[in-house]
């Protein structure tokens, strides 16, 4: 859970209590044990742009 008073992390990143900052979810592929990766799994990925109107 994100610390009180912290701005929400941008899409594709998640709050790390161990590091006190937002971390890029992309790094979870290489190191899934990181504490913030739980937040990445819960957050939906950035939406794909539709190819039709």
């Amino acid at each position: 859970e994100q610390a009180p008073g912290q701005a929400p992390c941008s899409r594709g990143s998640s709050w790390s209590a161990d590091l006190d900052k937002c971390m890029d979810c992309a790094s979870c592929r290489a190191r899934p044990h990181s504490d913030f990766c739980l937040g990445c799994a819960a957050a939906p990925p950035a939406p794909f742009r539709l190819l039709w109107p």
């Epitope: 209590a17 006190d20 044990h33 990181s34 504490d35």
Partner: antibody, heavy 120, light 108 residues
Framework: EVQLLESGGGLVQPGGSLRLSCAAS????????MIWVRQAPGKGLEWVSY????????HYADSVKGRFTISRDNSKNTLYLQMNSLRAEDTAVYYC?????????????WGQGTLVTVSS | DIQMTQSPSSLSASVGDRVTITCRAS??????LNWYQQKPGKAPKLLIY???SLQSGVPSRFSGSGSGTDFTLTISSLQPEDFATYYC??????????FGQGTKVEIK
């Protein structure tokens, strides 16, 4: 110049308590994760505990969990290790070390160490 | 827990020798491997981080390589000040880190 200076070590009886300090200077202390690592006489390095930059997140080795408490005072640029219920196997030189500034992948600065001897 | 095993535990070498120390992880740790040098009575000193990156101020005769489970620290031409104990450390499971048991480099 980055410096980490441990203090508080000494001789203590089994079951006793000790509080180690690590005074940081030469850098802005508050953004960095910190750890304690120990080294028993003639042995290798053993990670003991970790604390996040704010102090809000802490982790411990199984060997010290429930007995040791890591904390920090960023206003005083100081890291602490409260050691309770000490055992003979806790006898070691205790080092504090600074984590890397982007992640805690490595520990780039270490103190000179303080010796803790647990003996009756 | 991830175990780190170094080999050899000790070695004897002469000034000018090329020295290689290996570190094996009990499971893949990608490239999250660091090397430290420790001299008697002194604190460990970071040499190599993330398997192959040379820490600032460390002589270029030190190099690191490897990924997955097998890693090496190489000293291309051993100098008198290099006689020490070397430790590997995995940070794949940071902040729960583990060290190898150490390799002592002695004078032949």
């Amino acid at each position: 110049e980055v410096q980490l200076l441990e203090s508080g070590g000494g001789l203590v009886q089994p079951g006793g308590s000790l509080r180690l300090s690590c005074a940081a200077s030469g850098f802005t202390f508050s953004p960095y994760p910190m750890i304690w690592v120990r080294q028993a006489p003639g042995k290798g390095l053993e990670w003991v505990s970790y604390i996040s930059p704010s102090g809000g997140s802490t982790h411990y080795a199984d060997s010290v969990k429930g007995r040791f408490t890591i904390s920090r005072d960023n206003s005083k640029n100081t890291l602490y290790l409260q050691m309770n219920s000490l055992r003979a196997e806790d006898t070691a030189v205790y080092y504090c070390a600074r984590g890397g500034d982007t992640y805690f992948d490595y520990f780039d600065y270490w103190g000179q160490g303080t010796l803790v001897t647990v003996s009756s | 827990d991830i175990q780190m095993t170094q080999s050899p535990s000790s070695l004897s070498a002469s000034v000018g020798d090329r020295v290689t120390i290996t570190c094996r992880a009990s499971q893949s740790i990608s490239g999250y491997l660091n090397w430290y040098q420790q001299k008697p009575g002194k604190a460990p000193k970071l040499l190599i981080y993330q398997a192959s990156s040379l820490q600032s101020g460390v002589p270029s005769r030190f190099s690191g390589s490897g990924s997955g489970t097998d890693f090496t620290l190489t000293i291309s031409s051993l100098q008198p000040e290099d006689f020490a104990t070397y430790y590997c450390q995995q940070s794949y499971t940071s902040p729960f880190i583990t060290f190898g048991q150490g390799t002592k480099v002695e004078i032949k």
